[in-house]
């Protein structure tokens, strides 16, 4: 069940300029998915694999694109929220 925030992020990811989506190298997508604890529940890649992916932002994994996306804190931009607004 997608929460409102997830839907909002998905809209951003699919429709906005490139800096709203940070996509790592393609080869990172090919690995077999591991199941986390629980019955068939997959672990959020943002919690481990991409834990430090966003510099000044929060990581959100977009399942549909199999890629992490960064939501930037105020004043920061860029695909990993690494740039400071002038």
């Amino acid at each position: 069940d997608l929460q409102e925030a997830d839907l909002d992020l998905l809209r951003v990811t699919l429709s906005s300029k490139p800096q709203a989506l940070a996509t790592p190298n393609k080869e990172e997508h090919g690995k077999r998915k591991k199941k986390g604890k629980g019955l068939g529940k997959k672990r959020d890649p943002c919690l481990r694999k991409y834990k430090d992916f966003c510099i000044h932002g929060e990581c959100k994994y977009v399942k549909e694109l199999r890629a992490p996306s960064c939501i930037c804190h105020p004043g920061y931009h860029g695909e990993r929220c690494h740039g400071l607004s002038l």
């Epitope: 932002g57 929060e58 105020p74 607004s85």
Partner: antibody
């Protein structure tokens, strides 16, 4: 439904410290920021700082750096603000609020706690 | 720091009339990346926490009556209440989230004439 419930009123003496809490429910705690804002009696809103529980990043108003410490406990979905070296001018209502996002950026506060009155008096 | 200045400090408007509150920032709040202005408006009634009305300068928060609207770009912004209702009596604040530290305007007190 989203709720932020803050701890009760506090009375402290000058020079003391206080730790206020803000318990969040009804949403994924790590996805949003928690910001702290204060309001002195009859005055406007003053931003103290904020924490992003997901990344652990904190940002402070320079005015409160070294005196305010923001933390978050993801296991209980609770954010804390500790304020040290209290003075009478710190008497205010302290609000926590959820910092939301859209279009790829955070920055505005869509849900607020009820506020905690802190009185600093000798 | 970005300084937010609201005008007027207080305003009295008749029921059913239009109320206009202005907010000026000391630097542009326009994000070049998404071409949006990082400005929010809040309403605060006595004894209550603030309530979000508008974000991105003109996007109305869910559940906010459509008599509230926000406009402006760059450094000059306006909150308009098209037809004042008794329940709109409150203090209104603008807030910038262009960069840290986040800052608020000093507030505008809206009363009924």
């Amino acid at each position: 439904q989203v709720q932020l419930v803050q701890s009760g009123a506090e009375v402290k003496k000058p020079g003391a410290s206080v730790k206020l809490s803000c318990k969040a429910s009804g949403y994924t705690f790590r996805t949003y920021g928690i910001t702290w804002v204060r309001q002195a009696p009859g005055q406007g809103l003053e931003w103290i700082g904020e924490i992003f529980p997901g990344s652990g990043n904190t940002y402070y108003n320079e005015k409160f750096k070294g005196r305010a410490t923001l933390t978050a406990d993801k296991s209980t979905s609770t954010a804390y603000m500790e304020l040290s070296s209290l003075r009478s001018e710190d008497t205010a209502v302290y609000f926590c609020a959820r910092e939301s996002f859209s279009d790829g950026y955070y920055g505005y506060f869509d849900y607020w706690g009820q506020g905690t009155l802190l009185t600093v008096s000798s | 720091d970005i300084v937010m200045t609201q005008s007027p400090d207080s305003l009295a408007v008749s029921l059913g009339e239009r109320a206009t509150i202005n907010c000026k920032s000391s630097q542009s709040l326009l994000y070049s990346t998404n071409q949006k202005n990082s400005l929010a408006w809040y309403q605060q009634k006595p004894g209550q926490p603030p309530k979000l009305l508008i974000y991105w300068a003109s996007t109305r928060e869910s559940g906010v009556p459509d008599r509230f609207s926000g406009s402006g770009s760059g450094t000059d912004f306006t909150l308009t209440i098209s037809s004042l209702q008794a329940e709109d009596v409150a203090v209104y604040y603008c807030q910038q989230y262009y960069r840290y530290p986040l800052t608020f305007g000093q507030g505008t007190k809206l009363e009924i004439k």
